[in-house]
């Protein structure tokens, strides 16, 4: 099966790499614009230059192209705790990231939020915090993991998943309650 090609891909595939078919004359292959520039005017004829102009401030193209407009630079999302790692240039979009001792959690493919790495208090670090993953903690005896924090088994209710980990403690609590002290 031949994969379905869009009109633009079909047009481009007829020309050699780095060129595209003139939209008004499919016998002409024009040279694509370099990254950092965009297409202002198609080449007038074979072997003649394509009119490419540099992207204006606040816009970019990251690869060779025949776009009529440059792409708008991304803005880092302050409300998500993001910080600018590198600013936008004509040939590269803004790079956003997180502060030191934070990790990225992706809510969707193109949206991430910065959260503080867990410190594993009342536990030990099983896996260190990474760019896109929180610290993995192993809790000490008498503690269980809840929302990536080690919480005392005294906070474990019978209905929760922690009962297996905290079983001895729960039995002790129950035993204390049952023994009628006067």
């Amino acid at each position: 099966l031949v994969p379905h090609l869009g009109d633009r891909e079909k047009r481009d595939s007829v020309c050699p790499q780095g060129k595209y078919i003139h939209p008004q004359n499919n016998s002409i292959c024009c040279t694509k614009c370099h990254k950092g520039t965009y297409l202002y005017n198609d080449c007038p004829g074979p072997g003649q230059d394509t009119d490419c102009r540099e992207c204006e401030s606040g816009s970019f193209t990251a690869s060779e192209n025949h776009l009529r407009h440059c792409l708008s630079c991304s803005k880092c999302r302050k409300e998500m705790g993001q910080v600018e790692i590198s600013s936008c240039t004509v040939d590269r979009d803004t790079v956003c990231g997180c502060r030191k001792n934070q990790y990225r959690h992706y809510w969707s493919e193109n949206l991430f939020q910065c959260f503080n790495c867990s410190l594993c208090l009342n536990g030990t670090v099983h896996l260190s915090c990474q760019e896109k993953q929180n610290t993995v903690c192993t809790c000490h005896a008498g503690f269980f993991l809840r929302e990536n924090e080690c919480v005392s088994c005294s906070n474990c209710k019978k209905s929760l998943e922690c009962t297996k980990l905290c079983l001895p403690q729960i039995e002790n609590v129950k035993g204390t309650e049952d023994s009628g002290t006067t």
Epitope: E79, F115, N134, E147
Partner: nanobody, 119 residues
Framework: EVQLLESGGGLIQPGGSLRLSCAAS????????MVWVRQAPGKGLEWVSH????????YYADPVKGRFTISRDNSRNTLYLQMNSLRAEDTAVYYC????????????RGQGTLVTVSS
Amino acid sequence: EVQLLESGGGLIQPGGSLRLSCAASGFTFAHETMVWVRQAPGKGLEWVSHIDRVGQDTYYADPVKGRFTISRDNSRNTLYLQMNSLRAEDTAVYYCAVLPKRGPWFDYRGQGTLVTVSS
């Protein structure tokens, strides 16, 4: 006690419009970034949109971009989601939530309102 109460859901035909509301109480609404998420039948939670504290910065997930508009009225402690050109794939329970701070889970989320898009 934090309370988030969604309303405005219902059965709507494809191409139709709905406006969801979320009444907030028990916290300083104007200090929080607010979020709409949705859960389609048999699927996980999907981020729909969010709006910063002052209503200046907004975000829309690709499937709803150009069709949905998020807004807020801080004087009324209310969050809105205007949904236009509705499609069958927009069928879901819609929840409003406070943007999490401690980790990737929702400490404060409403009970949800069901939106069904069907002819």
